[in-house]
Interface confidence: low
């Protein structure tokens, strides 16, 4: 449909408050680093120019497209060039342009302080004091830090947010009741953040297409029981969603998000007996729930595939007449039956089905070219089994903290170049797969372990791009994205490394480290492990083992002490001593 | 040792062509996407374009739809870039990457598009 007033249509299919948390999330993702009060007036004044736009579409500027208005309004801010450098060349641009340089100087690991939370009674005093700016300065803070955050996901976190304040601050014991509702939102928004940024590189690493495959291959098999064609209409209709949001068209984004919600509810009959009590939800947790609910059940009986896809003499034909339909088909067909396994298993079958099909239907005779096809699945459905089922019985004879440190070890032999920082952060993630997927049974195992380690090891890709050191990493992840996963498992050790310089203040450790929390301390002990391992990439795990048990008992030690500070100091040297001498430094 | 050497570049006029190469050594060209970068000498790089391993899938900035085109020959491991309806603000040294890239690991080739 042509609006006369895209800022007007917006606002009256959004809502004014809606409207107000979108432009700001917008405002918060492209501008990350401007204070909130400076935000707070930038949408202020857009909102107020949409109401004139909405009394007459007429009025001046109306017409005028949402990347212009907001683009031009971002521009208005005076201290672009000091605050951000090159990103102001960006305002000398026309749109599309402008809209594409802003987009491209996002930053995935923006300079921002810890957020740090303060203790509830001050929360919950600024909450009743003015709600309205604690919950906008929610949004702000998360937009910020997490640029590629899904915009109308977030709004559905505000109001949990919201909700946890409104029960908590009058219950008894506000802190017990607060602060896991609090944590629980953290480490949930982490992990949607992490999933749509994966989403996002698919779409501008790798094209739309990569996109939809993904989508077809996550659909089919949440949705067993819906027809290819109406498989395909969610596709297309989804991958506009999230083209929009990556995009930073959020309001389009937000929109079309709550028309598909609205069409796959008035159609969930053709779709999955699974969505009923999600259509029963307000919008936001209706959204919410249809993306994260259940798959059906399969249909029964369902034939082998092998008769259209390996035994039919119309395979080629088919194929000529609309490659990427019937490849549609074969992975729409594959996913459905295969809930057991992983997106990025079932793409990496569907590639290997084309790949066979563009050889063989060039070949004398195609049909004895491609007959065994199937046998070649083999080895790609084994491999990840096979190490999915190691690495649960390592974390189960481990634990998470010493199953993090066997990941840290082993990428940071794989890739020392990358910083300490991020060799940390990854492979904390990495490590948690198995507290996440290691208690499923078998057959939800694969799709857990490798679909979430795809989004973490997006998590280095992204991060490695912004500042490339490795060789190694570059081609990991530029390579192809359904085999990420298997390109960083099949890197050993770098031989070509040379090792880091050793520094004793890099080992220096002060009393400060006693008040940390124990996650905190971990992270700590992890930093200093992966330094171990960048001055020393041969060292074994027995002499890693030994200098870190030291290392523990060590702060153990020295927290317990009277004079904390000289403890750190005289038994610190000693240790760095013994480590070196250990470690043949 | 990876090793990307582009050509191609030189003195042209507003509306006219130019032919870009990039000769790929040292890693398995055929297996990777490759970008084109351009930088202006005081500016960042700006990402220009770029296609997938097999040459299927092209991508392109909007401020050079249309009128550049992307290719690739995987048996002679060379990119290139067609630029056709040339303008001034086209001048740039032009270098091509691995992947999606825009850090810089060749010398890159000169094109100025004068009016």
């Known amino acids: 449909d042509a609006h006369k007033s895209e800022v007007a249509h917006r606002f009256k299919d959004l809502g004014e408050e809606n409207f107000k948390a979108l432009v700001l999330i917008a405002f918060a993702q492209y501008l990350q680093q401007c204070p909130f009060e400076d935000h707070v007036k930038l949408v202020n004044e857009v909102t107020e120019f949409a109401k004139t736009c909405v009394a007459d579409e007429s009025a001046e500027n109306c017409d005028k497209s949402l990347h212009t208005l907001f683009g031009d309004k971002l521009c208005t801010v005076a201290t672009l060039r000091e605050t951000y450098g090159e990103m102001a060349d960006c305002c000398a641009k026309q749109e599309p342009e402008r809209n594409e340089c802003f987009l491209q100087h996002k930053d995935d690991n923006p300079n921002l302080p810890r957020l740090v939370r303060p203790e509830v009674d001050v929360m919950c005093t600024a909450f009743h004091d003015n709600e309205e700016t604690f919950l906008k300065k929610y949004l702000y803070e998360i937009a910020r830090r997490h640029p590629y955050f899904y915009a109308p996901e977030l709004l559905f976190f505000a109001k949990r947010y919201k909700a946890a304040f409104t029960e908590c601050c009058q219950a008894a014991d506000k802190a017990a009741c607060l602060l896991p509702k609090l944590d629980e939102l953290r480490d949930e928004g982490k992990a949607s953040s992490a999933k749509q940024r994966l989403k996002c590189a698919s779409l501008q690493k790798f094209g739309e297409r990569a996109f939809k495959a993904w989508a077809v291959a996550r659909l089919s098999q949440r949705f067993p029981k819906a027809e290819f064609a109406e498989v395909s209409k969610l596709v297309t209709d989804l991958t506009k969603v999230h083209t929009e949001c990556c995009h930073g068209d959020l309001l389009e984004c937000a929109d079309d998000r709550a028309d598909l919600a609205k069409y796959i509810c008035e159609n969930q009959d053709s779709i999955s007996s699974k969505l009923k009590e999600c259509c029963e939800k307000p919008l936001l947790e209706k959204s919410h729930c249809i993306a994260e609910v259940e798959n059906d059940e399969m249909p029964a009986d369902l034939p082998s595939l092998a008769a259209d896809f390996v035994e039919s003499k119309d395979v080629c034909k088919n194929y000529a007449e609309a490659k990427d339909v019937f490849l549609g088909m074969f992975l729409y067909e594959y996913a459905r039956r295969h809930p057991d396994y992983s997106v990025v298993l079932l793409l990496r079958l569907a590639k290997t089905y084309e790949t066979t099909l563009e050889k063989c239907c060039a070949a004398a005779d195609p049909h004895e070219c491609y007959a065994k096809v199937f046998d070649e699945f083999k080895p790609l459905v084994e491999e990840p089994q096979n190490l999915i089922k190691q690495n649960c019985e390592l974390f189960e004879q481990l634990g998470e903290y010493k199953f993090q440190n066997a990941l840290l070890v082993r990428y940071t032999k794989k890739v020392p170049q990358v910083s300490t920082p991020t060799l940390v952060e990854v492979s904390r993630n990495l490590g948690k797969v198995g507290s996440k997927c290691c208690k499923h049974p078998e057959a939800k195992r694969m799709p857990c372990a490798e679909d979430y380690l795809s989004v973490v090891l997006n998590q280095l890709c992204v991060l490695h791009e912004k500042t490339p050191v490795s060789d190694r990493v570059t081609k990991c992840c530029t390579e192809s994205l359904v085999n990420r996963r298997p390109c960083f498992s099949a890197l050993e050790v770098d031989e070509t490394y040379v090792p880091k310089e050793f520094n004793a203040e890099t080992f220096t450790f002060h009393a400060d480290i006693c008040t940390l929390s124990e996650k905190e301390r971990q992270i700590k002990k992890q930093t200093a492990l992966v330094e171990l391992v960048k001055h020393k990439p041969k060292a074994t795990k027995e002499q890693l083992k030994a200098v870190m048990d030291d290392f523990a008992a060590f702060v153990e030690k020295c927290c317990k002490a009277d004079d904390k500070e000289t403890c750190f100091a005289e038994e610190g040297k000693k240790l760095v001593a013994a480590s070196q001498a250990a470690l043949g430094l | 040792e990876v090793q990307l050497v582009e050509s191609g570049g030189g003195l042209v006029q507003a509306g006219g062509s130019l032919r870009l190469s990039c000769a790929a050594s040292g890693f398995t060209f055929g297996s990777f996407g490759m970008s084109w970068v351009r930088q202006v000498p005081g500016k960042g790089p700006e990402w220009v374009s770029a296609i997938d391993s097999g040459g299927t899938d092209t991508r392109y900035a909007e401020s050079i739809k249309g009128r550049f085109i992307i290719s690739r020959d995987n048996a002679k491991k060379t990119l290139y870039l067609q630029m056709n309806s040339l303008k001034p603000e086209d001048t740039a040294v032009y270098y091509c990457?691995?992947?999606?890239?825009?850090?810089?690991g060749s010398q890159g080739t000169q094109v100025t598009v004068s009016s």
């Open positions: 990457t691995i992947g999606q890239s825009t850090s810089r």
